[in-house]
Protein backbone atom coordinates (compact mmCIF):
# COMPACT_ATOMS: atom_id res chain seq x y z
CA UNK A 1 0.00 0.00 0.00
CA UNK A 2 1.49 3.43 -0.96
CA UNK A 3 2.46 5.73 1.95
CA UNK A 4 0.34 8.78 2.80
CA UNK A 5 3.04 10.45 4.91
CA UNK A 6 6.82 10.40 4.90
CA UNK A 7 9.60 10.69 7.48
CA UNK A 8 11.40 13.93 8.29
CA UNK A 9 13.65 15.10 5.43
CA UNK A 10 11.50 13.21 2.92
CA UNK A 11 8.68 14.25 0.60
CA UNK A 12 5.83 12.35 -1.02
CA UNK A 13 5.70 12.15 -4.80
CA UNK A 14 4.12 9.63 -7.14
CA UNK A 15 2.98 7.63 -4.12
CA UNK A 16 6.50 7.21 -2.79
CA UNK A 17 8.78 8.89 -0.29
CA UNK A 18 11.86 10.62 -1.70
CA UNK A 19 14.74 12.21 0.20
CA UNK A 20 14.82 16.02 0.29
CA UNK A 21 17.98 17.72 -0.94
CA UNK A 22 20.22 18.97 1.84
CA UNK A 23 20.90 22.68 2.41
CA UNK A 24 23.24 24.01 -0.27
CA UNK A 25 21.80 21.70 -2.95
CA UNK A 26 18.86 21.87 -5.39
CA UNK A 27 16.65 19.16 -6.84
CA UNK A 28 17.55 17.78 -10.27
CA UNK A 29 15.19 14.78 -10.37
CA UNK A 30 12.82 13.01 -8.02
CA UNK A 31 13.60 9.52 -6.84
CA UNK A 32 11.99 6.51 -8.47
CA UNK A 33 11.44 2.93 -7.42
CA UNK A 34 15.00 2.26 -8.52
CA UNK A 35 16.91 5.56 -8.07
CA UNK A 36 17.68 8.03 -5.26
CA UNK A 37 16.68 11.69 -5.42
CA UNK A 38 19.26 13.52 -7.55
CA UNK A 39 20.57 16.82 -6.15
CA UNK A 40 23.21 19.30 -7.33
CA UNK A 41 25.18 21.91 -5.35
CA UNK A 42 24.08 25.52 -5.75
CA UNK A 43 26.29 27.62 -7.99
CA UNK A 44 28.50 30.56 -7.04
CA UNK A 45 26.42 33.41 -5.49
CA UNK A 46 23.51 31.04 -4.84
CA UNK A 47 22.17 29.33 -1.72
CA UNK A 48 19.44 27.17 -0.22
CA UNK A 49 19.25 27.23 3.56
CA UNK A 50 16.80 24.36 4.24
CA UNK A 51 16.23 20.70 3.35
CA UNK A 52 14.30 21.23 0.14
CA UNK A 53 12.92 20.10 -3.20
CA UNK A 54 13.60 23.40 -4.95
CA UNK A 55 14.69 23.20 -8.57
CA UNK A 56 16.42 26.59 -8.41
CA UNK A 57 18.74 28.02 -5.76
CA UNK A 58 18.15 31.56 -4.42
CA UNK A 59 20.48 34.37 -5.41
CA UNK A 60 22.63 35.82 -2.64
CA UNK A 61 21.48 39.25 -1.50
CA UNK A 62 23.41 42.12 -3.12
CA UNK A 63 24.67 44.73 -0.68
CA UNK A 64 24.29 47.81 -2.85
CA UNK A 65 26.88 50.45 -1.90
CA UNK A 66 24.64 53.08 -3.55
CA UNK A 67 22.15 52.37 -0.75
CA UNK A 68 24.88 52.67 1.90
CA UNK A 69 25.14 48.88 2.28
CA UNK A 70 28.21 46.70 2.71
CA UNK A 71 28.74 42.97 3.26
CA UNK A 72 28.75 42.01 6.93
CA UNK A 73 28.92 38.27 6.29
CA UNK A 74 29.58 36.66 2.92
CA UNK A 75 26.99 34.13 1.81
CA UNK A 76 27.71 30.42 1.39
CA UNK A 77 25.83 27.71 -0.49
CA UNK A 78 23.75 27.29 2.68
CA UNK A 79 23.41 30.87 3.89
CA UNK A 80 22.43 34.21 2.41
CA UNK A 81 24.76 37.21 2.44
CA UNK A 82 24.16 39.50 5.43
CA UNK A 83 24.30 43.21 4.67
CA UNK A 84 24.96 46.00 7.12
CA UNK A 85 25.37 49.75 6.79
CA UNK A 86 28.45 51.83 6.25
CA UNK A 87 29.89 53.64 9.30
CA UNK A 88 27.57 56.42 10.43
CA UNK A 89 24.49 54.82 8.89
CA UNK A 90 21.92 52.29 10.11
CA UNK A 91 19.42 49.90 8.53
CA UNK A 92 15.89 51.11 7.79
CA UNK A 93 14.42 47.63 8.46
CA UNK A 94 15.26 44.28 9.97
CA UNK A 95 15.97 42.93 6.47
CA UNK A 96 18.48 45.79 6.04
CA UNK A 97 17.55 46.63 2.47
CA UNK A 98 18.73 50.24 2.71
CA UNK A 99 20.45 52.62 5.13
CA UNK A 100 19.90 56.08 6.54
CA UNK A 101 22.31 58.45 8.23
CA UNK A 102 22.48 58.24 12.05
CA UNK A 103 20.47 60.93 13.77
CA UNK A 104 22.36 63.60 15.73
CA UNK A 105 21.13 64.81 19.10
CA UNK A 106 20.38 68.54 19.02
CA UNK A 107 21.75 71.04 21.56
CA UNK A 108 19.91 70.48 24.84
CA UNK A 109 19.91 66.73 24.21
CA UNK A 110 22.59 64.12 24.79
CA UNK A 111 23.17 60.67 23.39
CA UNK A 112 21.51 58.03 25.54
CA UNK A 113 22.49 55.17 23.23
CA UNK A 114 24.96 55.37 20.36
CA UNK A 115 23.61 54.08 17.05
CA UNK A 116 24.63 50.70 15.73
CA UNK A 117 24.39 49.21 12.23
CA UNK A 118 20.78 48.27 12.98
CA UNK A 119 19.52 50.95 15.40
CA UNK A 120 19.43 54.73 15.32
CA UNK A 121 20.88 57.10 17.90
CA UNK A 122 18.67 57.45 20.99
CA UNK A 123 18.68 60.98 22.42
CA UNK A 124 17.47 62.23 25.80
CA UNK A 125 16.96 65.75 27.15
CA UNK A 126 19.75 67.05 29.37
CA UNK A 127 18.40 67.40 32.91
CA UNK A 128 19.00 70.38 35.19
CA UNK A 129 22.70 70.29 36.06
CA UNK A 130 23.74 69.08 32.59
CA UNK A 131 24.04 70.63 29.14
CA UNK A 132 24.89 69.92 25.51
CA UNK A 133 25.79 72.81 23.22
CA UNK A 134 26.44 70.74 20.10
CA UNK A 135 24.55 68.61 17.61
CA UNK A 136 26.19 65.19 17.89
CA UNK A 137 25.61 61.49 17.35
CA UNK A 138 28.13 60.63 20.09
CA UNK A 139 28.17 63.27 22.83
CA UNK A 140 26.37 62.73 26.14
CA UNK A 141 25.14 65.67 28.23
CA UNK A 142 27.99 67.27 30.19
CA UNK A 143 27.64 68.29 33.86
CA UNK A 144 27.66 72.00 34.57
CA UNK A 145 30.96 73.32 35.88
CA UNK A 146 31.05 73.33 39.68
CA UNK A 147 32.03 76.91 40.45
CA UNK A 148 32.26 76.12 44.18
CA UNK A 149 35.08 73.63 43.70
CA UNK A 150 37.07 76.38 41.98
CA UNK A 151 36.34 78.90 44.77
CA UNK A 152 34.18 80.83 42.32
CA UNK A 153 30.47 81.63 42.23
CA UNK A 154 27.87 81.23 39.51
CA UNK A 155 27.62 84.49 37.59
CA UNK A 156 25.17 83.12 35.05
CA UNK A 157 22.92 80.12 35.46
CA UNK A 158 23.40 77.12 33.22
CA UNK A 159 20.73 75.83 30.87
CA UNK A 160 20.28 72.54 29.03
CA UNK A 161 22.25 74.14 26.16
CA UNK A 162 24.86 76.17 28.06
CA UNK A 163 27.27 75.69 30.93
CA UNK A 164 27.18 77.93 33.99
CA UNK A 165 29.45 80.96 33.90
CA UNK A 166 31.66 81.20 36.97
CA UNK A 167 33.04 84.42 38.40
CA UNK A 168 35.08 85.67 41.35
CA UNK A 169 33.69 85.63 44.91
CA UNK A 170 34.24 89.36 45.37
CA UNK A 171 31.23 90.19 43.20
CA UNK A 172 28.86 89.14 45.97
CA UNK A 173 26.07 91.64 46.38
Amino acid sequence: EPPTACREKQYLINSQCCSLCQPGQKLVSDCTEFTETECLPCGESEFLDTWNRETHCHQHKYCDPNLGLRVQQKGTSETDTICTCEEGWHCTSEACESCVLHRSCSPGFGVKQIATGVSDTICEPCPVGFFSNVSSAFEKCHPWTSCETKDLVVQQAGTNKTDVVCGPQDRLR
Partner: antibody
Framework: QVQLQQSGAELMKPGASVKISCKAT????????IEWVKQRPGHGLEWIGE????????NYNEKFRGKATFTADTSSNTAYMQLSSLTSEDSAVYYC???????????????WGQGTLVTVSA | DIVMSQSPSSLAVSVGEKVTMTCKSS????????????LAWYQQKPGQSPKLLIN???TRESGVPDRLTGSGSGTDFSLTISSVKAEDLAVYYC?????????FGGGTKLEIK
Protein backbone atom coordinates in the same frame (compact mmCIF):
# COMPACT_ATOMS: atom_id res chain seq x y z
CA GLN B 1 19.26 74.84 61.61
CA VAL B 2 18.04 76.21 58.27
CA GLN B 3 15.15 78.65 58.61
CA LEU B 4 13.34 80.90 56.15
CA GLN B 5 11.25 83.71 57.62
CA GLN B 6 8.86 85.46 55.26
CA SER B 7 7.22 88.87 55.56
CA GLY B 8 3.61 89.24 56.63
CA ALA B 9 0.34 89.19 54.71
CA GLU B 10 -0.38 91.98 52.21
CA LEU B 11 -3.68 93.45 51.02
CA MET B 12 -3.08 95.21 47.70
CA LYS B 13 -5.05 97.17 45.12
CA PRO B 14 -5.21 95.96 41.49
CA GLY B 15 -2.39 97.49 39.42
CA ALA B 16 -0.10 97.95 42.43
CA SER B 17 3.19 96.16 43.15
CA VAL B 18 4.21 94.21 46.22
CA LYS B 19 7.62 93.10 47.48
CA ILE B 20 7.80 89.98 49.63
CA SER B 21 10.89 89.20 51.71
CA CYS B 22 12.45 85.93 52.80
CA LYS B 23 15.17 86.09 55.51
CA ALA B 24 17.45 83.05 55.65
CA THR B 25 19.39 81.80 58.67
CA UNK B 26 21.40 78.69 59.53
CA UNK B 27 23.41 78.28 56.32
CA UNK B 28 25.62 80.14 53.84
CA UNK B 29 22.97 82.23 52.10
CA UNK B 30 24.98 83.15 49.01
CA UNK B 31 25.61 79.61 47.73
CA UNK B 32 22.14 78.02 47.62
CA UNK B 33 19.33 78.80 45.20
CA ILE B 34 16.22 80.37 46.68
CA GLU B 35 13.05 79.15 44.97
CA TRP B 36 9.71 80.96 44.83
CA VAL B 37 6.43 79.03 44.64
CA LYS B 38 2.83 80.22 44.24
CA GLN B 39 -0.15 78.43 45.78
CA ARG B 40 -3.73 79.32 44.94
CA PRO B 41 -6.67 77.29 46.26
CA GLY B 42 -7.61 74.74 43.61
CA HIS B 43 -4.46 75.47 41.59
CA GLY B 44 -1.89 73.49 43.56
CA LEU B 45 1.75 74.59 43.57
CA GLU B 46 3.41 76.56 40.79
CA TRP B 47 7.15 77.21 40.51
CA ILE B 48 7.80 80.89 39.78
CA GLY B 49 11.58 80.76 39.54
CA GLU B 50 14.83 80.92 41.50
CA UNK B 51 17.73 83.20 42.39
CA UNK B 52 21.27 82.43 43.47
CA UNK B 53 21.93 85.18 46.03
CA UNK B 54 25.72 85.20 45.66
CA UNK B 55 25.60 86.44 42.09
CA UNK B 56 22.01 87.46 41.50
CA UNK B 57 21.76 84.82 38.75
CA UNK B 58 18.12 83.89 38.08
CA ASN B 59 15.89 81.39 36.32
CA TYR B 60 12.26 82.33 35.69
CA ASN B 61 9.27 80.26 34.70
CA GLU B 62 8.29 81.95 31.41
CA LYS B 63 4.71 82.18 32.71
CA PHE B 64 5.90 84.61 35.43
CA ARG B 65 8.53 86.53 33.46
CA GLY B 66 7.57 90.21 33.67
CA LYS B 67 5.29 89.53 36.62
CA ALA B 68 7.91 88.49 39.19
CA THR B 69 11.35 89.99 39.80
CA PHE B 70 13.87 88.40 42.17
CA THR B 71 16.61 90.19 44.09
CA ALA B 72 18.79 89.26 47.04
CA ASP B 73 20.81 91.15 49.64
CA THR B 74 23.70 89.07 50.97
CA SER B 75 24.49 91.59 53.72
CA SER B 76 21.13 90.86 55.38
CA ASN B 77 20.71 87.28 54.07
CA THR B 78 17.37 88.25 52.56
CA ALA B 79 15.79 87.35 49.23
CA TYR B 80 12.99 89.39 47.72
CA MET B 81 10.30 88.82 45.13
CA GLN B 82 8.47 91.78 43.63
CA LEU B 83 5.14 91.18 41.91
CA SER B 84 3.99 93.95 39.57
CA SER B 85 0.69 95.01 37.95
CA LEU B 86 -1.31 92.97 40.43
CA THR B 87 -4.64 91.42 39.48
CA SER B 88 -7.01 89.08 41.31
CA GLU B 89 -5.14 86.18 39.64
CA ASP B 90 -2.14 87.09 41.78
CA SER B 91 -4.06 86.53 45.02
CA ALA B 92 -2.26 83.54 46.52
CA VAL B 93 0.13 82.30 49.18
CA TYR B 94 3.73 82.75 48.06
CA TYR B 95 6.47 80.57 49.49
CA CYS B 96 10.21 80.92 49.40
CA UNK B 97 12.16 77.70 49.68
CA UNK B 98 15.82 76.76 49.70
CA UNK B 99 16.78 74.21 47.12
CA UNK B 100 19.12 71.36 47.84
CA UNK B 101 21.46 72.10 45.02
CA UNK B 102 24.63 70.54 43.72
CA UNK B 103 26.01 71.08 40.26
CA UNK B 104 25.70 67.58 38.85
CA UNK B 105 22.19 67.03 40.18
CA UNK B 106 18.72 68.47 40.03
CA UNK B 107 17.08 70.60 42.62
CA UNK B 108 14.35 69.73 45.05
CA UNK B 109 12.97 72.14 47.64
CA UNK B 110 14.47 71.09 50.95
CA UNK B 111 13.39 73.93 53.27
CA TRP B 112 10.31 76.15 53.06
CA GLY B 113 9.28 79.49 54.52
CA GLN B 114 5.91 79.83 56.26
CA GLY B 115 4.32 81.56 53.26
CA THR B 116 3.08 85.08 52.60
CA LEU B 117 -0.57 85.64 51.74
CA VAL B 118 -1.10 88.31 49.10
CA THR B 119 -4.69 89.42 48.55
CA VAL B 120 -5.52 91.68 45.60
CA SER B 121 -8.84 93.44 45.99
CA ALA B 122 -10.34 96.73 44.92
CA ASP C 1 6.86 71.95 30.06
CA ILE C 2 6.69 68.57 31.77
CA VAL C 3 3.13 67.90 32.94
CA MET C 4 2.72 66.04 36.23
CA SER C 5 -0.56 64.20 36.87
CA GLN C 6 -1.53 62.79 40.24
CA SER C 7 -4.28 60.34 41.10
CA PRO C 8 -6.55 60.03 42.86
CA SER C 9 -7.21 63.67 43.64
CA SER C 10 -8.52 62.61 47.05
CA LEU C 11 -9.03 59.45 49.07
CA ALA C 12 -10.33 58.56 52.51
CA VAL C 13 -8.83 55.68 54.49
CA SER C 14 -9.04 54.31 58.00
CA VAL C 15 -6.13 54.44 60.45
CA GLY C 16 -3.89 51.41 59.96
CA GLU C 17 -4.79 50.92 56.28
CA LYS C 18 -2.26 50.92 53.46
CA VAL C 19 -2.59 53.61 50.82
CA THR C 20 -0.88 54.21 47.47
CA MET C 21 -1.06 57.37 45.38
CA THR C 22 0.39 57.74 41.90
CA CYS C 23 2.16 60.43 39.91
CA LYS C 24 2.72 60.34 36.15
CA SER C 25 4.99 62.62 34.13
CA SER C 26 4.54 63.57 30.47
CA UNK C 27 8.18 62.68 29.75
CA UNK C 28 10.70 60.37 31.38
CA UNK C 29 12.36 61.71 34.52
CA UNK C 30 15.06 59.04 34.42
CA UNK C 31 18.43 60.34 33.24
CA UNK C 32 20.61 57.57 31.86
CA UNK C 33 23.79 59.49 32.73
CA UNK C 34 23.32 58.86 36.45
CA UNK C 35 20.37 56.43 36.49
CA UNK C 36 18.44 58.82 38.72
CA UNK C 37 14.78 59.81 38.58
CA UNK C 38 14.36 63.56 39.06
CA LEU C 39 11.24 63.38 41.22
CA ALA C 40 10.39 64.60 44.74
CA TRP C 41 7.38 64.12 47.01
CA TYR C 42 6.07 66.74 49.48
CA GLN C 43 3.50 66.63 52.26
CA GLN C 44 1.40 69.68 53.10
CA LYS C 45 -0.65 69.49 56.28
CA PRO C 46 -3.62 71.87 56.74
CA GLY C 47 -2.43 75.43 57.37
CA GLN C 48 1.25 74.51 56.98
CA SER C 49 3.98 74.87 54.37
CA PRO C 50 4.89 71.89 52.21
CA LYS C 51 7.53 69.57 53.67
CA LEU C 52 9.99 67.50 51.62
CA LEU C 53 9.48 63.75 52.09
CA ILE C 54 11.37 62.05 49.28
CA ASN C 55 13.90 62.98 46.60
CA UNK C 56 15.33 60.99 43.66
CA UNK C 57 11.92 59.21 43.61
CA UNK C 58 12.76 56.88 46.49
CA THR C 59 15.27 58.49 48.89
CA ARG C 60 13.57 59.34 52.19
CA GLU C 61 14.50 62.63 53.87
CA SER C 62 15.93 62.19 57.36
CA GLY C 63 13.15 62.10 59.94
CA VAL C 64 10.56 60.77 57.48
CA PRO C 65 9.07 57.53 58.86
CA ASP C 66 9.85 54.36 56.93
CA ARG C 67 6.15 53.61 56.51
CA LEU C 68 6.32 56.18 53.68
CA THR C 69 7.93 54.72 50.56
CA GLY C 70 8.52 56.29 47.17
CA SER C 71 8.93 54.07 44.13
CA GLY C 72 8.76 54.06 40.34
CA SER C 73 10.91 55.05 37.40
CA GLY C 74 10.67 56.85 34.07
CA THR C 75 7.17 58.28 33.90
CA ASP C 76 5.28 56.31 36.57
CA PHE C 77 5.79 56.90 40.28
CA SER C 78 3.98 56.16 43.52
CA LEU C 79 4.01 57.07 47.18
CA THR C 80 2.84 54.37 49.57
CA ILE C 81 1.96 54.75 53.24
CA SER C 82 2.04 51.24 54.68
CA SER C 83 -0.04 51.95 57.79
CA VAL C 84 -1.84 55.29 57.84
CA LYS C 85 -1.81 57.35 61.03
CA ALA C 86 -4.08 60.30 61.89
CA GLU C 87 -1.06 62.63 61.50
CA ASP C 88 -0.82 61.69 57.80
CA LEU C 89 -3.88 63.83 57.03
CA ALA C 90 -2.44 66.11 54.34
CA VAL C 91 -2.15 66.87 50.64
CA TYR C 92 0.75 65.08 48.91
CA TYR C 93 2.45 66.63 45.89
CA CYS C 94 4.99 65.22 43.44
CA UNK C 95 7.44 67.53 41.68
CA UNK C 96 9.81 67.03 38.77
CA UNK C 97 13.18 68.75 38.83
CA UNK C 98 14.43 67.23 35.57
CA UNK C 99 13.93 70.41 33.56
CA UNK C 100 12.89 74.05 33.85
CA UNK C 101 10.30 75.08 34.70
CA UNK C 102 10.00 72.76 37.68
CA UNK C 103 6.43 71.49 37.83
CA PHE C 104 4.19 69.95 40.49
CA GLY C 105 1.34 67.51 40.30
CA GLY C 106 -2.12 68.67 41.29
CA GLY C 107 -1.88 66.87 44.63
CA THR C 108 -3.61 63.96 46.36
CA LYS C 109 -5.65 64.84 49.44
CA LEU C 110 -5.52 62.11 52.08
CA GLU C 111 -8.48 62.14 54.46
CA ILE C 112 -8.98 59.94 57.49
CA LYS C 113 -12.30 58.09 57.85
Amino acid sequence: QVQLQQSGAELMKPGASVKISCKATGYTFSTYWIEWVKQRPGHGLEWIGEILPGSGSTNYNEKFRGKATFTADTSSNTAYMQLSSLTSEDSAVYYCARSYYTYDQGSWLAYWGQGTLVTVSA
Amino acid sequence: DIVMSQSPSSLAVSVGEKVTMTCKSSQSLLYSGNQKNYLAWYQQKPGQSPKLLINWASTRESGVPDRLTGSGSGTDFSLTISSVKAEDLAVYYCQQYYSYPYTFGGGTKLEIK
